[in-house]
Interface confidence: low
């Protein structure tokens, strides 16, 4: 290490801190009895500049004169070389060449501000240093400010440059003075326009007008008097990307024509005095404002379901999807549903608030049409019109070979083949899905998507949960009729968690009827494909017999006629999904009382 100079010393003259261009004398001397041998000529002293040899001498001391040292720190190390041994470090020294102040820059904040300059001090010499900042202007005017703080790198002249002669040149220079001497920065020359940085615009306001069907707004602000250029930036509050506009001689106002309705925007403005001189002001404070609503665009995606009630009545359930934010263009206050009997011409209009569905009961006779539109404070969207028809009535239009395959945890790929006939009549397909739910299904949400007539597959992912069975329908729709096919499908699935619970076994004319309770929906773990009924003689070690029944939603009983009379059997059931078989349900014993053949 440099500071462990046990064997000798390194001295530097005139000083270890020097001015750029100065010459230094470096000497290295051994302490008594620290050489290779008493004979001085066997002691070879070597001087290194960093890792490069620059001098050597046989004896107890070495002297070297060094010039041309660069700015910053240079390390010199003296080593002793003895015959047949490694070089031994004697001592070393760091020589610092002081840097002149650099990167002087000056700025005046605003037309009424004062000139202040900053600079880089350079590497610290640890010498007491005074800084003098000098500004000279036209007509031999000079201003001077001094700073006796060793760490000084900023001074404010306290003077205000005025625009009377904007092309007049000013020159600033900073000089550092310490015990070594003085060193000045390169001078910085500038004009009023170069260094005045305007204050950011203030008092920003926005005014909205209605011009044709586009929201036009005017942005107003106040600026300092000499500002020539402005740049505006604006964005929706939930966006990270700014739109930028440059304007010349705006005089505190600018029209914006491309704002989206019913959107909160952020606006900021910056100013500059000259096209190519000077610097931009800081951005102004942010103005936040919401653009006004405009009437909705786009049309609602509407679907419906029909349900037979009795010989004269049917229930129609309408469903529609929310408009996107860009289509709604405001807060949707209500949906307007119009129901019309085409033959009698009667019209019923109803405003629906807070729902995206509507159910009504209508006559089974007559032709009916519905129209649904969305309304905000400025108006209504174009209505979506649908003629109510029997969606599954046209067998020739039914898609065939419908399949549903798990694509991921939360999506199902539905594929189908076009109708065998009337292929050209198909205008679109609608794929509809809802959770399979035994019993009342009127409260179960309905999902759908539309697909063009050339598609024969659709990936459904909205409201798809794993381990859940969905009833999926594919409709082929023409101008005035529809055909449909249905299938059960699930995404991720497992074997059911439990088997059906046998709740009763009854005897009927020599066979038995087994009744069971459905497996709870949350334990089915997907679409059930089959039930299995197992039976074997009690106390027998033989393999059980089994009967496999295809799963049907409403079925919960099944006959078996292969049991022997007066033999006690044990019976149980399991359920299967495509992923496997459940564990067995409860066991029941039964003995058929009928006569033996």
């Amino acid at each position: 290490k440099i500071d462990e100079c046990k064997r000798g010393d390194v001295t530097v003259k005139p000083s270890r801190v020097i001015l750029l261009g100065s010459t230094v004398n470096i000497s290295c001397s051994l302490k008594p009895r620290q050489g290779c041998s008493p004979y001085s000529r066997r002691n070879k002293l070597i001087l290194y500049k960093f890792d490069r040899r620059i001098n050597f001498h046989h004896g107890h001391s070495l002297n070297a004169q060094v010039t041309g040292l660069p700015l910053g720190t240079t390390l010199f190390v003296c080593k002793l070389a003895c015959i047949n041994s490694d070089e031994i470090q004697i001592c070393g020294a760091e020589i610092l060449v002081g840097e002149q102040p650099q990167n002087l820059s000056c700025i005046q904040k605003g037309e009424q501000g004062t000139v202040a300059c900053t600079w880089e001090r350079g590497q610290d010499t640890h010498l007491y240093t005074e800084y003098t900042l000098q500004l000279s202007g036209p007509k031999n005017l000079t201003w001077q400010k001094q700073c006796k703080d060793h760490y000084c790198d900023y001074l404010d002249f306290g003077i205000n440059l005025t625009p009377e002669s904007p092309e007049s040149n000013f020159t600033a220079k900073v000089t550092a003075v310490n015990s070594l001497g003085s060193s000045s920065s390169f001078p910085s020359t500038f004009t009023f326009l170069d260094i005045v940085r305007p204050l950011p615009p203030w008092d920003i306001r926005i005014k909205f007008q209605k011009a044709s069907s586009v929201s036009r707004c005017t942005l107003y602000w106040r600026d300092e008097g000499l500002v020539l250029l402005n740049r505006l930036r604006y964005r929706p509050s939930n966006s990270r990307h700014w739109n930028m506009v440059n304007v010349t001689e705006a005089r505190g106002r600018h029209d914006l024509l491309d704002l989206k309705p019913f959107t909160e925007y952020e606006f900021q403005i910056s100013s500059k005095l000259h096209l190519y001189k000077g610097s931009w002001s800081d951005w102004s404070e942010t103005l936040r404002a919401q653009t006004p609503e405009e009437e909705p665009t786009g049309m609602l995606d509407v679907w419906y379901m029909k349900r037979h009630i009795d010989y004269s009545r049917q229930q129609i359930s309408l469903f529609w999807k929310n408009l996107s934010v860009s289509e709604a263009r405001g807060k949707i206050l209500h949906y307007q549903v119009t129901l019309q009997e085409l033959t009698g011409g009667k019209v019923m209009t109803q405003n629906i608030t807070g729902h995206t569905s509507w159910t009504t009961v209508i006559s089974r006779t007559g032709n009916w049409a519905v129209a649904v539109s969305a309304a905000n404070s400025k108006g209504n969207s174009l209505p979506t019109r649908i003629n109510i028809m029997n969606l599954c009535e046209a067998g020739l239009l039914a898609p065939h070979q419908v399949s549903a395959n798990s694509e991921s945890m939360d999506s199902i790929l539905v594929t189908w083949q076009p109708p065998r006939k009337d292929l050209s009549a198909v205008q679109e397909y609608v794929v509809e899905w809802r959770q399979l739910h035994p019993g009342d299904d009127t409260q179960i949400p309905l999902n759908w998507l539309r697909s063009p007539p050339y598609n024969v597959s659709a990936l459904i992912s909205e409201n798809i949960k794993p381990y859940t069975c969905y009833e999926i329908r594919v409709y082929a729709l023409s101008e005035d009729q529809g055909g449909c096919s249905s299938i059960l499908g699930n995404s991720e699935h497992k074997a059911p968690l439990s088997g059906p619970h046998i709740n009763a076994i009854t005897e009927e004319k020599g066979s038995i009827l087994i009744s069971w309770n459905s497996i709870p929906v949350q334990e089915q773990m997907g679409c059930l494909l089959h039930y299995r009924i197992y039976w074997k003689e009690r106390d027998s070690n033989s393999q059980p017999q089994l009967c496999e029944i295809p799963y049907r939603v409403s079925q919960n009983s099944h006959p078996i006629n292969s049991l022997q009379p007066r033999v006690t059997y044990v019976l149980w059931m399991t359920a299967l999904t495509a992923a496997g078989e459940s564990s067995q349900g409860n066991e029941r014993e039964f003995c058929l009382q009928g006569k033996a053949n």
């Epitope: 509050s237 939930n238 990270r240 909160e264 952020e266 942010t286 936040r288 404002a289 919401q290 807060k331 206050l333 608030t353 807070g354 729902h355 404070s377």
Partner: antibody
């Protein structure tokens, strides 16, 4: 799941500045509006303002002159500074996550700050 | 500045329907949210965007908003629903809370 936790001194002297930090854990601070809301003892809720993850802010006009909200996305934290406090600023201070449609779906547990000499 | 007005208190018998109103100028044109707060706890969102219910909030809570009034309806009120209820809306870039309503289940 995402959780919010307020931290800061429970006692502040009058005329000093109240400083609180809210740490968001279990999720990112990105793409939400983060707010400070207070509730004086036995009274209702008062909103201070929000900060978006980009640093843009919006303040309640009645408190704007005394309030600063800042965000440090690298630490998943945002902070409240309320200057020149008086006894009337004694309250439970909550941090909350807001959506673009201005409801608060996630709240911190709240921290009681008392202003007293 | 915009104000939302709520009744200070509402009482209801268990199993009955409770309605808490919140009124403000043209409130129907703004999105209303509702929170309940039990003693010593943070507020909890129960209705947002006038009618929507966050997951985990029972179906007995519903909301509506039109004209100058937003209404929180609790059907089949239970003892656990006793709390302070606050409405909230957004006006001129400011979040505004109602003064709160104490719901008492008798």
């Amino acid at each position: 799941q995402v959780q919010l936790q307020e931290s800061g001194p429970g006692l502040v002297k009058p005329s000093e500045t109240l400083s609180l930090t809210c740490t968001v854990s279990g999720g990112s601070i990105s793409s939400y509006y983060w707010s400070w809301i207070r509730q004086p003892p036995g009274k209702g809720l008062e909103w201070f303002g929000y900060i978006y993850d980009s640093g843009s802010t919006n303040y309640n006009p009645s408190l704007k002159s005394r309030v600063t909200i800042s965000v440090d996305t690298s630490k998943n934290q945002f902070s409240l500074k309320l200057s020149s406090v008086t006894a009337a600023d004694t309250a439970v201070y909550y941090c909350a996550r807001g959506s673009y449609f201005w409801y608060f779906d996630l709240w911190g547990r709240g921290t009681l700050v008392t202003v007293s000499s | 500045s915009y104000e939302l007005t709520q009744p200070p208190s509402v009482s209801v018998s268990p199993g009955q329907t409770a309605s808490i109103t919140c009124s403000g100028d043209k409130l129907g044109a703004k999105y209303a949210s509702w929170y309940h707060q039990k003693p010593g706890q943070s507020p909890v969102l129960v209705i947002y965007q006038d009618t929507k219910r966050p997951s985990g909030i029972p179906e007995r809570f519903s909301g509506s908003n039109s004209g100058n009034t937003a209404t929180l309806t609790i059907s089949g009120t239970q003892a656990m629903d006793e709390a302070d209820y606050y409405c909230q809306a957004w006006d001129s870039s400011t979040v505004v809370f109602g003064g709160g309503t104490k719901l008492t289940v008798l």
